[in-house]
Amino acid sequence: DYKDDDDKLSTSKTIDMELVKRKRIEAIRGQILSKLRLASPPSQGEVPPGPLPEAVLALYNSTRDRVAGESADPEPEPEADYYAKEVTRVLMVDRNNAIYEKTKDISHSIYMFFNTSDIREAVPEPPLLSRAELRLQRLKSSVEQHVELYQKYSNNSWRYLGNRLLTPTDTPEWLSFDVTGVVRQWLNQGDGIQGFRFSAHCSCDSKDNKLHVEINGISPKRRGDLGTIHDMNRPFLLLMATPLERAQHLHSSRHRR
Amino acid sequence: DYKDDDDKLSTSKTIDMELVKRKRIEAIRGQILSKLRLASPPSQGEVPPGPLPEAVLALYNSTRDRVAGESADPEPEPEADYYAKEVTRVLMVDRNNAIYEKTKDISHSIYMFFNTSDIREAVPEPPLLSRAELRLQRLKSSVEQHVELYQKYSNNSWRYLGNRLLTPTDTPEWLSFDVTGVVRQWLNQGDGIQGFRFSAHCSCDSKDNKLHVEINGISPKRRGDLGTIHDMNRPFLLLMATPLERAQHLHSSRHRR
Amino acid sequence: ALDTNYCFSSTEKNCCVRQLYIDFRKDLGWKWIHEPKGYHANFCLGPCPYIWSLDTQYSKVLALYNQHNPGASASPCCVPQALEPLPIVYYVGRKPKVEQLSNMIVRSCKCS
Amino acid sequence: ALDTNYCFSSTEKNCCVRQLYIDFRKDLGWKWIHEPKGYHANFCLGPCPYIWSLDTQYSKVLALYNQHNPGASASPCCVPQALEPLPIVYYVGRKPKVEQLSNMIVRSCKCS
């Protein structure tokens, strides 16, 4: 059973390479349909003419682009994660909402609130949620700062979620935090307004606790500019979830091999 | 090229299972020798009689036991990581050393200093270092606390390395922090005393910044007890490195395939 | 998952992790590894069927991609998914050494 | 590593990641995926030699375990190591959907 060193992909074997390519292409045909739980390609009869809506393209681009802090590791794939996940996004509650009033004059943090009912529209049952990322667009900055993310926990308490060392940048940069567990918790708790706090890292002996990072759609000096592009760039939750109908199909047709 | 569902490991194929087991066993023989860079098993002529020294067993057990904070993920394996790593441990500088004097009355942190020359004995060249873990034994505790680890950076500055949420525990518990990059830095900087700070997480508006966690071999109330067992349990660096002689062999015989 | 929990307690015929304990003395004839005396190495074995669609059962094939060819390989193979390291103690001359060998224990398998 | 950087720029005969661009329209005859138009799927191919020791070249075999049978498999296979997801846009009726498909792009391979 010893394979000799000369057992190579020699020129006489180019036909093999073509065969393998054809097989791989056919396997991908099956893989994509299988991941989408489709027995055949979907009908295109009702597809509206013209280009894709801008919001859909923006969502596609958000999903495609790797952003700072997002893990690029190959994901291990439990059974449910094999299937395709629908991607949606939920923008944070508008900055003009009264809920932000009492957070205005705090220099060490910025706050982002979300309406759980918006999230539930995208994810009707909590176990369907596969991943949730909080995405923030950081504006260009010449300073380095160590920042932290907290989850609103109870009336006046915050639970630490994670941190990041932000280095200077010449261009706006998207940041991503994995908040899957938090969003699942929110869904488990019923409806309401829930939030995150993005803070300077305050060390035990530090004097300057001011947050020097500016976030698109939040930082005060840009609050007047609420145009569409800007609005698309305000903090949002990127949600990946199994669509309800696929989950039901997946469950009813599942059997042990 | 379609494989039928009946292509199973049927009883008629039990011989295959035995053959595969034999092949796997033979492959493991080669794998272990290969990882140790041995052409044949080492001679046992000079091995001293009697059981293994206690310190060696303790080191073996430290390596074998998974501890809180240590990643249990399958490690991806770059070429150099294929080969076996020698495991050694370097205890922190004794608490009676004068270097700890000025850190005595700080309530938010505890300090651990290491002598780079001790580390260099185990790892003569920085590139040989494959992994370094800081291991601390936390004593039993009824409180939850969010803690942070810092690296001594310059005279009076500290660089943030990581954090952990420590939940109450009924028994002493080992904590592990990956400090590979830090130790490699130390080795690159030449000899001297280097250190870590283990601190309470001080939030921007927190009042109580006291560290409530007690670490074996550091916490004041147990400072008198410096018996052997206790000493083995004081903070240490667990180092994994390619032995120098193996690295030289590895380098001289390496070739692109 | 095709891990030890599932595979060791089932009679799965397809790709799964199989039990294999290696006793250094008995199986390899080695006395030079002082600790451990042996270890659960395990291995992956079993076919990864349903690779190519036969038109007659295309939907059946699609439903089984998940288990049998999740990576859409041209010829999937039953291979290790999660591996764990093994520390050993042995002597070089009079000096005992503790060394860690990476990726020695197979915890789960997959069709890849 | 047997990744796109190394494999695409060499003529490696053994296990390596091979280039394969899938054009949904041309290769699969599909018009229903609106974005992307195609993607670099790639695949793994090539033998994992030096599996069993011939006594005559035992030390040569040992030196090559690293590349050709690092997991000490009974019959090693050239399989994906690092995989990446692919987002797509398609319509269900009149409604556009963005979905993410996991483990679609092969970035590197290994003998396993």
């Epitope: 439990p78 059974e79 449910a80 539930r120 009707p124 049952e125 909590p126 176990p127 369907l128 949620l129 899957t180 567990g181 699942r184 488990n188 708790q189 019923g190 409806d191 309800l244 989950a247 039901q248 469950h251 009813s252 042990r256 | - | 998952a1 599932y6 | -």
Partner: antibody, heavy 113, light 110 residues
Framework: QSLEESGGRLVTPGTPLTLTCTTS????????MNWVRQAPGKGLEWIGL?????TTYYANWAKGRFTVSKTSTTVDLKMTSPTTEDTATYFC??????????WGPGTLVTVSS | AYDMTQTPASVEVAVGGTVTIKCQAS??????LAWYQQKPGQPPKQLIY???TLASGVSSRFKGSGSGTQFTLTISGVECADAATYYC????????????FGGGTKVEIK
């Protein structure tokens, strides 16, 4: 795919007891795992659950009296200090909200002095 | 809290008749509701999930409807085998609750 509860027995008040739900054929990471009880002749009473991430939720009356935890294939219910009112059949339930759930056959706990 | 109130507590019905059981949530739970049937000495059997989706293997004589706070289980063409206790359950929220189940409705056949 199945669930089976075990550990139910006769205990005296105040004696801690752990019930175990052993699962097979599915991954616990994809489901919410609940404990539900039913006293003789009474209705169903939800005790608590552990979600995909291992986060636990409890009924108000169960907080401090019960602890739910899970491993890769089992879900435990620890009764810290049972009283006679805790006499019931205890069920382990796999729930996804969006699909048919799965119940174990139940295990009987009798608390009596 | 999301409290579930089930009515009636018991009902008697003739073979071939129709039974309607109601379940009211104290706050909106969208469509996150399930219905169960339980016979003595057995674990409950799920009939309906997501308010109106019939679980596999369940007779189409069972019908679930409603959303928000008002839900109904209707059993038409009642058979002797339908004698059991029926429960509703919300799966909308798991925090700060006393129970996720309704109190139950005992269905007896005349």
């Amino acid at each position: 795919q199945s669930l089976e509860e075990s550990g139910g027995r006769l205990v005296t008040p105040g004696t801690p007891l752990t019930l175990t739900c052993t699962t097979s054929g599915f991954s616990l990471n994809n489901y919410y795992m609940n404990w539900v009880r039913q006293a003789p002749g009474k209705g169903l009473e939800w005790i608590g659950l552990t979600d995909n991430d291992g986060t636990t939720y409890y009924a108000n009356w169960a907080k401090g009296r019960f602890t739910v935890s899970k491993t890769s294939t089992t879900v435990d219910l620890k009764m810290t200090s049972p009283t006679t009112e805790d006499t019931a059949t205890y069920f382990c339930v796999r729930d996804a909200g969006y699909s048919r759930n799965l119940w174990g056959p139940g295990t009987l706990v009798t608390v009596s002095s | 809290a999301y409290d579930m109130t089930q009515t009636p507590a018991s009902v008697e019905v003739a073979v071939g008749g129709t039974v309607t059981i109601k379940c009211q949530a104290s706050q909106s739970i969208s469509s996150s509701l399930a219905w169960y049937q339980q016979k003595p000495g057995q674990p409950p059997k799920q009939l309906i999930y997501r308010a109106s989706t019939l679980a596999s293997g369940v007779s189409s004589r069972f019908k679930g409807s409603g959303s928000g706070t008002q839900f109904t289980l209707t059993i038409s063409g009642v058979e002797c085998a339908d004698a059991a206790t029926y429960y509703c359950q919300q799966t909308y929220s798991w925090s700060g609750l006393d129970n996720v189940f309704g109190g139950g409705t005992k269905v007896e056949i005349k």
